[in-house]
Amino acid sequence: GDLLIQKTIKKQVVLEEGTIAFKNWVKTGTEVYRQFWIFDVQNPQEVMMNSSNIQVKQRGPYTYRVRFLAKENVTQDAEDNTVSFLQPNGAIFEPSLSVGTEADNFTVLNLAVAAASHIYQNQFVQMILNSLINKSKSSMFQVRTLRELLWGYRDPFLSLVPYPVTTTVGLFYPYNNTADGVYKVFNGKDNISKVAIIDTYKGKRNLSYWESHCDMINGTDAASFPPFVEKSQVLQFFSSDICRSIYAVFESDVNLKGIPVYRFVLPSKAFASPVENPDNYCFCTEKIISKNCTSYGVLDISKCKEGRPVYISLPHFLYASPDVSEPIDGLNPNEEEHRTYLDIEPITGFTLQFAKRLQVNLLVKPSEKIQVLKNLKRNYIVPILWLNETGTIGDEKANMFRSQVTGKIN
């Protein structure tokens, strides 16, 4: 009996036309939502003038439906048993699942000012930037609508730069009508234990953002894993959002709509400093902000963001070192709300429920030559927003799953 089930599973999880896996893989049958909480800065003037702690108040959720578009350019390669594809991006605002509208205003760090002062370290260039910042009446902080902040706005300071620069700024700009990839993943035809594992991303096996093993593209995209998952496994996956591969470890057995699943979580060790977790040495890219690689819980992804000083963390700086959150008031990290988990059905390796949580932060540093940053006495890793991307298998799909997979085994 078990052998027959294994044979059936192996056949059905292959990523090729006609299998259950392929149908759900091309276009997810699960509704995926991305909730945003924006960190509204309460004391912009005090920060700018006196280098005070930044007082933030989170506002949200603002919810978008995402990942509703089918994979594009799906191409099988029989020679190396891979399938390549693009994952299109799309987001639709869901007013009924949100606390307000896309027109709601927030006081946030001025993204362009913080980024430009970081990218252009030359003092003379900073003086040029300063005159443009003043001319455009820009400051260290700005008021922006949710729509502008997420999806883009024309920045008045960058619009004055007399040579060609992108004048549109947004945390997720450009998003709609763009695609992530090309991904090339193993289809599992020749070896089911490699199914969904990424072979190349954007035509490469490495990212070119990190040194050594940190630069590797490991595992799947976390939507599924090779079948027959064991609790002892460390599940590797790659997330383009954070420009790196990461891993999850087994935490507990969970019953999801009558389906036994394994809950895998991202452990605090994955965010530790190289002092605590030597494997993380290559995620420490500079010595000053990281306090000689002793800070933890924040990931500098500037190399992946055209030099813009973007730092990724868990929401509310969960699992981050005290020095990171010390200059920020109003954060309340807790594991239940702020960690990432994957609920995996172990026989098929399918992720039936997940909550991917991350926080987008921007570094802002004092600058002698930029007036609005002149009074800062320290560096700040400023939280801009955090997001919770969730998906849960629908009731209908769960019934089908129970009858066709778990029911057969039990």
Epitope: N122, Q123, V125, M127, S131, P162, K369, Q371, K374
Partner: antibody, heavy 115, light 107 residues
């Protein structure tokens, strides 16, 4: 050693243009911006503008805006200052000088504007 | 624009004297003041850069002080070779602006 060598003296007619060159050596040209300063006979120093060869960032003094053009050629480590619509008041020694603190200077180029 | 008012325009001293030159700026420029010496027929020479920093190779009899808007340049124990024009330059903001210059004559 750091050296800034400027082009030779020029005599120009009013209304014409002049282009002064400044060849840098002894350091990586794109590491530092090049500033331009002029000094009329018996007068003080006057900042005209500066260019950062790395980013192409340029700033001009308001007085010269629209009349001066600064360029930099990284391949030859040479900076240029072109001043157009010359008038007699533009008769001066023109200096290129490195960095914000003007730590090294060219020998100067005398531009005489006379009909 | 930050204007820089330099005084005096002219001063005379004898070897061994101490002289001071003042530069006052119209805006707060922190300590972003530089001082130059220029002799006839030569380009200016940087003596002291931002932060009252004496340049390598410049004799220690030259010094400067000041922060914000008031700056002072001092030559102790003057020597005959110090006869020159002296200029201050603010490098805090654009446009960069010079003082009008001080002519120092050695008797």
């Amino acid at each position: 050693e750091v050296q800034l060598v400027q082009s030779g003296a020029e005599v120009k007619k009013p209304g014409s243009s002049v282009k002064v060159s400044c060849k840098a050596s002894g350091y990586r040209f794109s590491d530092y911006e090049m500033q331009w300063v002029r000094q009329a006979p018996g007068q003080g120093l006057e900042w005209m503008g500066g260019i950062d060869p790395e980013t192409g960032g340029i700033a001009y003094a308001q007085k010269f805006q629209g009349r001066v053009t600064l360029t930099a050629d990284k391949s030859t480590s040479t900076a240029y200052m072109e001043l157009s619509s010359l008038r007699s008041e533009d008769t001066a020694v023109y200096y290129c000088t490195r960095k914000l603190d003007f730590d090294y200077w060219g020998q100067g180029t005398l531009v005489t504007v006379s009909s | 624009e930050t204007t820089v008012t330099q005084s005096p325009a002219f001063m005379s001293a004898t070897p061994g004297d101490k002289v001071t030159i003042s530069c006052i700026t119209s805006t707060d420029i922190d300590d972003d003041m530089n001082w130059y010496q220029q002799k006839p027929g030569e380009p200016p020479k940087l003596l002291i850069s931002e932060g009252n920093t004496l340049r390598p190779g410049v004799p220690s009899r030259f010094s400067s002080s000041g922060y914000g808007t008031d700056f002072t340049f001092t030559i102790n124990n003057i020597e005959s070779e110090d006869a020159a024009y002296y200029y201050c330059l603010q490098s805090d903001n654009l446009p960069l602006t010079f003082g009008q210059g001080t002519k120092l004559e050695i008797k």
